[in-house]
Every structure is written in C-alpha cells, then in structure tokens.
C-alpha cells in the first residue's frame, strides 16, 4: 500500500550535470543546459516528486510527474520508461507499482540519488546514450557504483 504525502518541485541531473527534461514527443532526455536554459525550458525541466508513505518501508517511495499542458507521470510498465498522461493517485493498494520508485541516497554520498523500481527489483532509472540522445531508461544493474544510475535532485520550492 502506498499513500500520497507531500510533493516538491525538482530539477534532476545526471552525474555529467546534464538536465532531465521532457521533449515535445514526451520522451525523458538529458541535455547540457545553463541555468537560464533550464529556466527557459520550464516547465519541461521541472519535475514534481510526489512522495508516498509505504506500508512496508523500503526507502522513500516517489512518483515523478511533469506538468506541461497536462500532468504526465513516469512509468516503467514492462520495464520501458515512458510518461503516461495521468495524475499520481492518492492511494495505491499494492506493494508494487509501475509509477513508484524508491529514491535513496548512494551510501556515503547524501547528494547522489538512485531510483529503484518498486515493480522490478534490481532495476534502476539510468541515463544511457543512444545515438546522439541521452535517454532516461530502466536498467537492470548489479554494479551499484555505476554513475549511470546516479542522479542529483535539486529542490526548486
């Protein structure tokens, strides 16, 4: 069971300092941006991190949304990352959900975060280069020190 708590506005970056944004095709991508680029591209660079209470504590449970024309929420259905046009629900009556990730700091580095899927144990949000694009993907990872699954989250509230 997950019960919705408070939300915060955040900018998410990979460890190469590229900024996560949602492009016109609703794809989550990373790109080099100055602070002014980041502001100019809002709200596509501003993510709503919705925190949830977890009936079996496993870290901070979050859903990640973005509000452009409508609210879209990050999903890892079938292990594929996409933004679905939906509001994060107030309650989820299950211990797993495609929109819930566990946000945890990397041990010894409170400013570096990992996001593990609640649906797929051992699968993490990751940044991966595909041709000329840096994409947000879900990746099965057994190298937990790999920088591709680490992010910084800057609160904008």
């Amino acid at each position: 069971y997950f019960g919705k708590l408070e939300s915060k506005l955040s900018i998410i970056r990979n460890l190469n300092d590229q900024v996560l944004f949602i492009d016109q095709g609703n794809r989550p991508l990373f790109e080099d941006m100055t602070d002014s680029d980041c502001r100019d591209n809002a709200p596509r660079t501003i993510f709503i991190i919705n925190m949830y209470k977890d009936s079996q504590p496993r870290g901070m449970a979050v859903a990640i949304s973005v509000k452009c024309e409508k609210i879209s929420t990050l999903s890892c259905e079938n292990r594929i990352i996409s933004f679905k046009e939906m509001n994060p629900p107030d309650n989820i009556k299950d211990t797993k959900s495609d929109i819930i990730f566990f946000q945890r700091s990397v041990p010894g580095h409170d400013n570096k975060m990992q996001f593990e899927s609640s649906s797929y144990e051992g699968y993490f949000l990751a940044c991966e280069k595909e041709r000329d694009l840096y994409k947000l993907i879900l990746k099965k990872k057994d190298e937990l020190g790999d920088r591709s699954i680490m992010f910084t989250v800057q609160n904008e509230d």
Partner: antibody, heavy 126, light 107 residues
C-alpha cells in the same frame, strides 16, 4: 536455504578444456546472478565473471574473456563455466557463488556473494 | 579496474587479541564492500556487507567500517575458530576485485 553443488574434481592436459557445473538446490528468489571465482594454490581469490540467468548476459574479467564461457540451464537450475586452452597456471579450485541483493534498514541495496559451492579442483598437468 | 590493496598480508595473534585488517580502494567504491573468511579446503563465508553490516549468524566480535576508499575489518577478541584467511571484495563496478587476502595465524 540455498545450496550450490558443484561437479567433481578434474584432471586435464594443457590445451584442453574443462566444464564445471553448479546446481542450485533449495528455494532461491529471482533477481540473482551466478559468479565464478577461483583460488590458485598459494594465491588469493580471483573473480572470473558472472552470468545473469534472466537473459544469459555475461560479464567476464579481461584476463579470461577469450577463454571462458559461462552458461546456465534454467530448466535444471544449473550454471556452467567452461575454460578452454588450459595451462598449468589454471590449476585452481573453482567456485560458483550467487550474487544477490541484501538490503539495509532503509531498503538500500547491496549485492553480495552469499551462497557458495563446495569448490571444484581442476588440475592441469601433462 | 579498481585495485584493492589489503594489508597486512599476514598477521600472527593470540586468542583474545584485537585484530584490524584494512583495504584501500583505488577509487571511490561508496560502501559497496564485503568481507569474507576462508578456511583451508572450504568455500569463502560472508561476514560483512555494505562495509559495516553484519551478516546473520556472524558473531558480533566482527565489525566493519569505512566508506569511499578506506575500509577496516576488526575482530575485537580473537577466538580459536577465527584463524583463517580474510578477503575484501569491491562490488561497486565490474570487474569485481578482491584484496590479496590476510592470513591470520596463531602466535
């Protein structure tokens, strides 16, 4: 309690190949990997590589990548490690081990080698 | 590759002694470090994971500490069954690498 049972000792000639098996018995959760580690006489532990039973993807240590093949048969819950072009320096005890997630009190994951096979002595001698 | 430098390579001690073994990583491995004990003719046994978390069933005289690049395994009061070889292992990135091992012998 998971147990790993390995095949018996082998004596091989230089240039030959050896295939060691590792059978899982007991209840094992999903999301684990098989790793292979060896210990040569008078030396320390040495990581050789791993296989993911979910998709058969492998990662090998650079020094073995041209000679080692790791496979897994999900139907029999058995992992295999084949080492080719054997030389005397490959004389060692070879271990299979499971690599899976343990968690701390906040749910943070750590991979560990928890269950180990009993080891298989491979002797390479002409 | 990440190098793990373990020291000392051997140590002689008596029952009741406090023994410390160190492992130094060549780069930041966070706390993705495990410690193993191996006795002759036996498979390694997990003692500590996450640098400082005691595996179930392991006596509390064993403890681990450290983060980043410097790690320590401490046995607070040696017991006869503790004489063995100890290894650290970094699990941060492939290839996984072990320390060279520390042989703990009876003085």
């Amino acid at each position: 309690q998971v147990q790993l049972v390995q095949s018996g000792a082998e004596v091989k000639k230089p240039g030959a190949s050896v295939k060691v098996s590792c059978k899982v018995s007991g209840e094992i959760s999903t999301g684990y990997y098989f790793h292979w580690v060896r210990r040569r006489p008078g030396k320390g532990l040495e990581w050789m590589g791993r296989i993911d039973p979910e998709d058969d993807s492998t990662k090998y240590a650079e020094r073995f990548k041209d000679r080692v093949t790791m496979t897994e048969d999900t139907s029999t819950d058995t992992a295999y490690m084949e080492l080719s072009s054997l030389r005397s320096e490959d004389t060692a005890v070879y271990y299979c081990t499971t690599w899976r997630i343990y968690r701390d009190s906040s749910g943070r994951p750590f991979y560990v080698m928890d269950a180990w096979g009993q080891g298989t002595l491979v002797t390479v001698s002409s | 590759d990440i190098q793990m430098t373990q020291s000392p390579s051997s140590v002689s001690a008596s029952v009741g002694d406090r023994v410390t073994i160190t492992c130094l990583a060549s780069e930041d491995i966070y706390t993705y470090l495990t410690w193993y004990q191996q006795k002759p003719g036996k498979a390694p046994k997990l003692l500590i994971y996450g640098a400082n978390k005691l595996q179930d069933g392991v006596p509390s005289r064993f403890s681990g500490s450290g983060s980043g690049t410097d790690f320590t395994l401490t046995i607070s009061s040696l017991q006869p069954e503790d004489f063995a070889t100890y290894y650290c292992l970094q699990g941060s990135k492939f290839p996984l690498t072990f320390g060279q091992g520390t042989k703990l012998e009876i003085k």
